[in-house]
Interface confidence: low
């Protein structure tokens, strides 16, 4: 066995291991002993958390620095023991220094709760060090925030109920224990991208949890089933949504990456899908007209199959700030698709598609197209994802989603793509001839495509333009249209009506 | 080591325009605001404003706001200051000065670039 | 904007003497900021949040003050000491400085 020490670091998360021995972190092998155990040399740092009531949207503003007994700068720069407070609480680090998501953040929440006290917990002595210094600190962190809250809770007027944390990466632990250590409940926590390793599989009390907060919502940005997990994978809150199934983000894939900076790593794929936590939460601010929802669902392949776009008993929600409180639920994961930038917003549709027969299919799936026509616009072409295999005299169900806001549809291409895409379909192609060389014809029968938005909760029927016409084979394409008595809504209740 | 080294001496005439630059090395770019400032031959310290590289966000005194435009080049790591309609009254040493947001204060200064103004 | 004053406008002192040098806001500022100035070289930070000074500054210095109201102190003056100070505020934008106290060696 190989006794080298390779130093494994992303952009927010440095490791040393023995190569061959345990990690440490996850759910075996964590250091219990050594967790959250702050070292006494770590905590002589002075000073170790302060807390920066930002008195301006901008970041030259220097604010104002609170202390626990020290009532005079809540005077001088006009606390409000009324209005809502939001501490934001960043993570580990690499640089030492604030990061440019953390003034994004200030400033929208400024703009958009324009009374409210802002403060940024800077912890940045303690969160600058090696990672397992930096998590065996934030229970320290948390202690600090808890004081501070005790404090201002002896101040007339000021109320835990309107105390909302902000914890990004680590920030979302820390943020945890300071909602556990605190006299009281807080309003609200809101876990960004909580950090995985070392928490992953951990005790409620050691991690983020629903118990700490009247209501914790997460985003979870970041989740390898594979690898080295950043974010952590575990659902930890009251609601856990998971953008884009937790993981691959879009716009933040290394050929992005590349394109848009000087210098493109795998290390800024990382920090794009672990910030992207962040700048959904700052989109929920600022782009309140644009609320983007999520679904319940068990997982997120169940989800890629289009079956839960569901809003019946709570199941669907807003996400980042705008999120209704729903403290009946824990751990419940919630899903929906973004796209690559502000607004973030998608329109999301279920289609249920019956096949009643299917010929000669071969061995490769079908790759179809659909593409939405509706009353205030078209969608692009857009692939229905196969997730298992398109089953014969069944109803298959599938996902897709548009950037643009197509309105009431009217009518929906199908096309049946006609050129294998890879050597390996087309060798699978040929065999598939092979083997059936007397009836090569591929051919699938559609009726009706069912149609549901996850947005508005409306179902349509669309039946085939030609009621005679209802085979479709590859290179072709067949059009269905809403059918006479196809409009059909249930009483579900829109998400739109469940905005706070 | 964190550097701003800002480009040489300028002569320029009245009513011209000019542009000066301010590398920065050593550092994370895009994580420091970047600041500028005027100061007149034995006078004291102006502040002109700020940009953020990350996103291209400025702030200015009002005083130089039709004077000073700032821009930032990211893949050079590089700040701008363009001064336009040059009088003698913009003689004068222009630095360029970092600072970390939320830490306030300018903890490393170009060496200066020195403006003269004649017809 | 948020005029600083600074006084004496130029002081002299003695090796070994103790000097103080104020600042004066015309409005109350959280914090103030102090620079150093040597002759053709760019100013330098030399205390930060009132009372913090920046890395390499010698414990002789200190500062002091709140409100409207600001001081530098060198408890024993040492030759490398002369230069102009500057003081600064980022309470409110735009962010202003000092007039500058300029200290010579008697």
């Known amino acids: 066995m190989s006794n080298s020490v390779p130093l494994l670091c992303f952009w927010s998360l440095c490791y040393c291991f023995a190569a061959g021995s345990p990690v440490p972190f996850g759910p075996e092998g964590r250091l219990e002993d050594k967790l959250h155990k702050p070292k006494a040399t770590q905590t002589e740092v002075k000073p170790s958390v302060r807390f920066n009531l930002r008195t301006s949207k901008d970041p030259e503003h220097e604010g104002c620095y609170l202390s626990v007994g020290h009532s005079q700068p809540l005077e001088d720069c006009s606390f409000n023991m009324t209005a809502k407070t939001f501490f934001i609480i960043h993570g580990w680090t690499m640089s030492g220094i604030f990061e440019n998501w953390l003034h994004k953040l200030v400033s929208a929440l400024h703009t958009r709760e324009k009374d409210a006290n802002v403060v940024v917990v800077d912890w940045l002595p303690l969160a600058h060090q090696l990672y397992t210094d930096a998590v065996n600190n934030t229970r320290v962190v948390g202690h600090s925030i808890a004081r501070m809250l005790d404090w201002l809770q002896e101040k007339d007027d000021f109320s835990l109920g309107n105390v909302h944390l902000i914890g990004y990466s680590l920030g979302a632990h820390v943020a945890g224990y300071a909602g556990n250590f605190v006299k009281g409940t807080v309003g609200r926590i809101t876990g960004l991208d909580p950090a995985g390793p070392m928490f992953e599989g951990a005790d409620i009390h050691k991690r983020l949890s629903p118990d700490d907060a009247d209501f914790v919502d997460v985003l979870h940005t970041y989740t390898r089933s594979f690898g080295l997990s950043i974010g952590i994978q575990m659902p930890v809150g009251h609601i856990d949504i998971y953008p884009n199934g937790g993981d691959f983000q879009p716009g933040c894939g290394l050929n992005d990456v590349l394109g848009s900076i000087a210098y493109g790593t795998i290390t800024e794929v990382v920090k794009c899908e672990h910030e992207r936590a962040v700048h959904l939460f700052v989109d929920s601010l600022v782009n309140q007209d644009k609320p983007s929802f999520a679904f319940q669902c068990t997982d997120s392949n169940r989800f890629k199959k289009g079956i839960c776009l569901s809003c019946r008993k709570n199941r669907c929600n807003s996400i980042g700030y705008n999120a209704k409180k729903m403290r009946n639920k824990r751990n419940s994961k919630m899903y929906l698709k973004t796209r690559a930038g502000m607004p973030f917003r998608v329109y999301h549709y279920q289609m249920k598609i019956h096949v009643f027969s299917y010929k000669n299919m071969g061995e490769i799936e079908p790759t179809f197209y659909v593409t939405l026509y509706g009353t205030n616009a078209d969608s692009q072409t857009l692939p229905l994802e196969i997730v298992e295999r398109i089953e014969q005299n069944a109803t298959n169900t599938f996902l897709v989603y548009t950037e643009e806001d197509l309105g009431d549809l009217l009518k929906i291409q199908l096309t049946w793509e006609g050129a294998s895409q890879s050597w390996y379909n087309l060798w699978k192609e040929f065999r598939s001839y092979l083997s059936q060389p007397r009836n090569p014809g591929r051919e699938l029968n559609i009726r009706r495509i069912r149609v549901k938005s996850g947005e508005t909760q409306r179902k349509l029927t669309f039946c085939t333009e030609d009621p005679e016409n209802t085979s479709i084979s590859p290179g072709r394409e067949l059009w269905f249209r809403k059918c006479r008595d196809g409009w059909r809504m249930k009483n579900e209740t829109s998400p739109t009506v469940e905005l706070p | 080591e964190v550097q701003l080294q800002q480009s040489g001496p300028e002569l320029l005439k009245p009513g011209a325009s000019v542009k000066i630059s301010c590398k920065a090395s050593?550092?994370?770019?895009?994580?420091?605001?970047m600041h500028w400032v005027k100061q007149s031959h034995g006078k004291s310290l102006e502040w002109i404003g700020s940009?953020?590289?990350?996103?291209?966000?400025?702030s200015y005194n009002e005083k130089f706001k039709d004077k000073a435009t700032l821009t930032v080049d990211k893949s050079s790591n590089t700040a701008y200051m363009e001064f336009r309609s040059l009088t003698s009254e913009d003689c004068a040493v222009y630095y360029c000065?970092?600072?970390?947001?939320?830490?306030?204060?300018?903890?490393?200064w170009g060496q200066g670039t020195t403006l003269t103004v004649s017809s | 904007e948020n005029v600083l004053t600074q006084s004496p406008a130029i002081m002299s002192a003695s090796l070994g003497e103790k000097v103080t040098m104020s600042c004066r806001a015309s409005?109350?500022?959280?914090?103030m900021y102090w620079y150093q100035q040597k002759s053709d070289a760019s100013p330098k930070l030399w205390i930060y949040?009132?009372?913090n000074l920046a890395p390499g500054v010698p414990d002789r210095f200190s500062g002091s003050g709140s409100g409207n109201s600001y001081s530098l102190t060198i408890s024993s003056m040492e030759g490398e000491d002369a230069a102009t100070y500057y003081c600064?505020?980022?309470?409110?934008?735009?962010?202003?400085f000092g007039g500058g106290t300029k200290l010579e060696i008697k």
């Open positions: 000065a970092r600072y970390g947001n939320y830490v306030g204060y300018f903890d490393y």
């Open positions: 050593g550092y994370t770019f895009t994580e420091y605001t």
């Open positions: 940009i953020n590289p990350y996103y291209g966000g400025t």
């Open positions: 409005s109350s500022v959280h914090y």
């Open positions: 949040y009132t009372s």
């Open positions: 600064q505020q980022f309470t409110s934008s735009p962010y202003t």
